[in-house]
Amino acid sequence: MNGRVDYLVTEEEINLTRGPSGLGFNIVGGTDQQYVSNDSGIYVSRIKENGAAALDGRLQEGDKILSVNGQDLKNLLHQDAVDLFRNAGYAVSLRVQHRLQVQNGPIGHRGEGDPSG
């Protein structure tokens, strides 16, 4: 029997202080540049070494960013999302969605990592 891959989705509020060279990460996504099929959300594609995000340690590549300083990132063009981050100020609050892959046992068996039980 094959194992089953599930995802444990969690949300977190991350407060970053803009460093000398900025926030220190790259994004993909947007209504004009879908990164995930049928999802125009904004995702972290790169954490820059020694940047503000890397030094904080919580933001990860693959995270989905839901909002910036309380402003929803739904239905934004890619460039508009970039501009939003660039103009977000010194203290930046990110609402992010982490998607943690959980490897379970065979189908029908609830493994230790199964979040459903």
Epitope: G22, G24, F25, I27, R46, V82, R86
Partner: nanobody
Framework: EVQLVESGGGLVQAGASLRLSCAAS????????MAWFRQAPGKEREFVAE????????WYSDSVKGRFTISRDNAKNTVYLQMNNLKPEDTAVYYC?????????????????????WGQGTQVTVS
Amino acid sequence: EVQLVESGGGLVQAGASLRLSCAASGGTFSSYAMAWFRQAPGKEREFVAEDSWSNHRVWYSDSVKGRFTISRDNAKNTVYLQMNNLKPEDTAVYYCAAHRDYSGSTVDPPNQSEYDYWGQGTQVTVS
């Protein structure tokens, strides 16, 4: 190691046009983000424009938006900066720069510390 050589600078009158070229060698050109910076006398070097081929994105500083156009020819390993309606305040040494292209767009303003390779510069003077 990537080598960058700029050309096309010169002395022009206000309102004129110039096209700068930057020829790259020593790397896979399409895998690099290419940019132009400039440094005016007595001022810090500032970002002008960037072309990120893999991300299909171009960026411009507010001061040149609508007047300057960055483009690239991957077959010729060359990036260009077409400068129209030049102003005296555009007078500077113009530098070509490159860094390995990464997935996605940086959320940070372009920062020269991210660029690994630099040309020697070409002088543009607008009278």
